[in-house]
Interface confidence: medium
Amino acid sequence: AITEAREEAKPYPLFPGPLPGSLQTDHTSLLSLPHTSGYQPALMFSPTQPGRPYTGNVAIPRVTSAGSKLLPPLAFKHTVGHIILSEHKDVKFNCSISVPNIYQDTTISWWKDGKELLGAHHAITQFYPDDEVTAIIASFSITSVQRSDNGSYICKMKINNEEIVSDPIYIEVQGLPHFTKQPESMNVTRNTAFNLTCQAVGPPEPVNIFWVQNSSRVNEQPEKSPSVLTVPGLTEMAVFSCEAHNDKGLTVSKGVQINIKAIPSPPTEVSIHNSTAHSILISWVPGFDGYSPFRNCSVQVKEVDPLSNGSVMIFNTSASPHMYQIKQLQALANYSIGVSCMNEIGWSAVSPWILASTTEGAPSVAPLNVTVFLNESRDNVDIRWMKPLTKRQAGELVGYRISHVWQSAGISKELLEEVGQNNSRAQISVQVHNATCTVRIAAVTKGGVGPFSDPVKIFIPAHGWVDHAPSSTPAPGNADPVLII
């Protein structure tokens, strides 16, 4: 007879801490099953043999050491094999086994779908010792079951290197259909066929699918899950969903919008970010893409000038970033700029046109006829030049920049002078005697500094002797500047 019922934590109880609704085990003591006198743990176990019933599930002791008693085979008692319940219900199931008291340190572990359950608030093991055997009941409880609890649960026990395995307890959590694949939003070409997929599972099975378009059922007869709906084509946007039905009821998928691809809307808010003499940096806000990704954009540029031929320059660019630097423009010119973008369906209309201007350019030519001569009495160098013929786009001449480089043995230094636009001559002090002075001049406008003239060299002798002949830029056709002493 069972004289005592105990509930203890076994060595290594299976799960941590209590879950609401589960029993609390005492995790502080280690249990050794009572060792009853008269039994010696000297049992022999049958080897595994092909065809032998219960192999791996049953430990079959032969005899006790005294040889007088044959102990019954060790096996978990049969229990319920299949539990069907609804989601969010509680469930409790157990394994039980009677173990002779000669065995010590027995442990029952729970496994689900072939994987050991490494921890559980859910597991409790109770021991009912008698004179010769201890009945062990390992209970497993789950509060508010979910689909993830579906599976095959077994108990395992190790005794003398033999593994005893219980029959599986299959837990089937039933509920409303659960979608494993729902239709996805799509952007489709007008009047072109496309497919939508819907898949749902139980248990319980079967799961049947109805399709819904704009709140109306598409199919009169349900299709077994999974279902593929082929839509021959649409001319306008539609919303599709699917209904999944099983014996527990119905679940409706999310509604998905199927859009019809169209040409994009024109870009808006074309803005000027930066203007130079020959380039303009613009940005724009893309219009609606027409449910199809932008492929590229086109920047259209017209010169606003009564004398221009009215031709349009077109610059193609990627759709992103929404920015483009228009290059190769005339300085000090006015332009009208528009942007259009395209997707796979076609080009958008052009954005509203905006006006933009380039700034003054730098001069494109250097001053002419540069001559240099030494004025020894004043110890300076006279420089003369002719004003360059600049284009209107270069803007108004604001002055000249003179570079003079002084070179003597081991020394070289460059100095820069700025003179006003009304000048066509300048004087610079002699910096070094017995040296060469190299002079170059550039015209300056608000647009910048133009190119420097070809260098003109003059030798500055030591004090006391000098030739006053000038040095000048070469006549056209001469290869090098000349130095006249």
């Epitope: 299976l14 941590p16 801490g17 921890g119």
Partner: antibody
Framework: EVKLVESGGGLVQPGGSLSLSCAAS????????MTWVRQPPGKALEWLGF??????????EYSASVKGRFTISRDSSQSILYLQMNALRAEDSGTYYC???????????????WGTGTTVTVSS | DIQMTQSPASLSASVGETVTITCRAS??????LAWYQQKQGKSPQLLVY???TLAEGVPSRFSGSGSGTQFSLKINSLQPADFGSYYC?????????FGGGTKLEIK
């Protein structure tokens, strides 16, 4: 004081073998599940396998990445856990830790005590 | 196998701030979740088990929460000793798996 000390790491060529040891002290070694975890340089921790306790026959479980190449065993008398690693690959390089499950395994399969680690480098 | 996804992968914070690290399981793991702290060049240390129970000796500024598939570790009033990497690990069933880690750095 509960203590785990790993040893046996070093440099080994791809395809080679290495055996790591973990000396345990300060607790009843036979009562605990014991595990090996590794950490490649600069990467996350990866569980390799464990050895169940005496009551569960010291049976073993392995991760898919090392199953068939690595073997976990114990010497209960000396309280040593072993990891025998064969057919090593470059991706097996890293720091190898041994750790124990808490004394009441049913308290959960987390790791309450860790060793200091030993470094394994697999390179030609 | 159950996948554990940790976020963010890295985080900068100042001493005294409060930070939260999250961990998501690919399926229901009830409360079978542990958190570990690992400092550079050191072995991991258990911080939290059963999703919210602090391990022995862990300061009360650490707290764990969550169950099912969503979990978080909160550190109040960050101290210099708290900087390092943090890992979550499930132990619902074999194989136990770790998250990819969160590196907590000083701002």
């Amino acid at each position: 004081e509960v203590k785990l000390v790993e040893s046996g790491g070093g440099l080994v060529q791809p395809g080679g073998s290495l055996s790591l040891s973990c000396a345990a002290s300060g607790f009843t070694f036979t009562d605990n599940y014991m595990t090996w975890v590794r950490q490649p340089p600069g990467k996350a921790l990866e569980w390799l396998g464990f050895s169940r306790n005496k009551a569960n026959g010291y049976t073993t479980e392995y991760s898919a990445s090392v199953k068939g190449r690595f073997t976990i065993s114990r010497d209960s008398s000396q309280s040593i856990l072993y990891l025998q690693m064969n057919a090593l690959r470059a991706e097996d390089s890293g720091t190898y830790y041994c750790a124990r499950f808490p004394p009441h395994y049913y308290a959960g399969g987390y790791f309450d005590v860790w060793g200091t680690g030993t470094t394994v480098t697999v390179s030609s | 196998d159950i996948q554990m996804t940790q976020s963010p992968a890295s985080l900068s914070a100042s001493v005294g701030e409060t930070v939260t690290i999250t961990c998501r399981a690919s399926e229901n793991i009830y409360s079978y979740l542990a958190w570990y702290q690992q400092k550079q060049g050191k072995s991991p240390q258990l911080l939290v088990y059963n999703a919210k129970t602090l391990a022995e000796g862990v300061p009360s500024r650490f707290s764990g929460s969550g169950s099912g598939t969503q979990f978080s570790l909160k550190i109040n009033s960050l101290q210099p000793a708290d900087f390092g990497s943090y890992y979550c690990q499930h132990y619902y069933r074999t194989p136990p798996t770790f998250g990819g880690g969160t590196k907590l750095e000083i701002k």
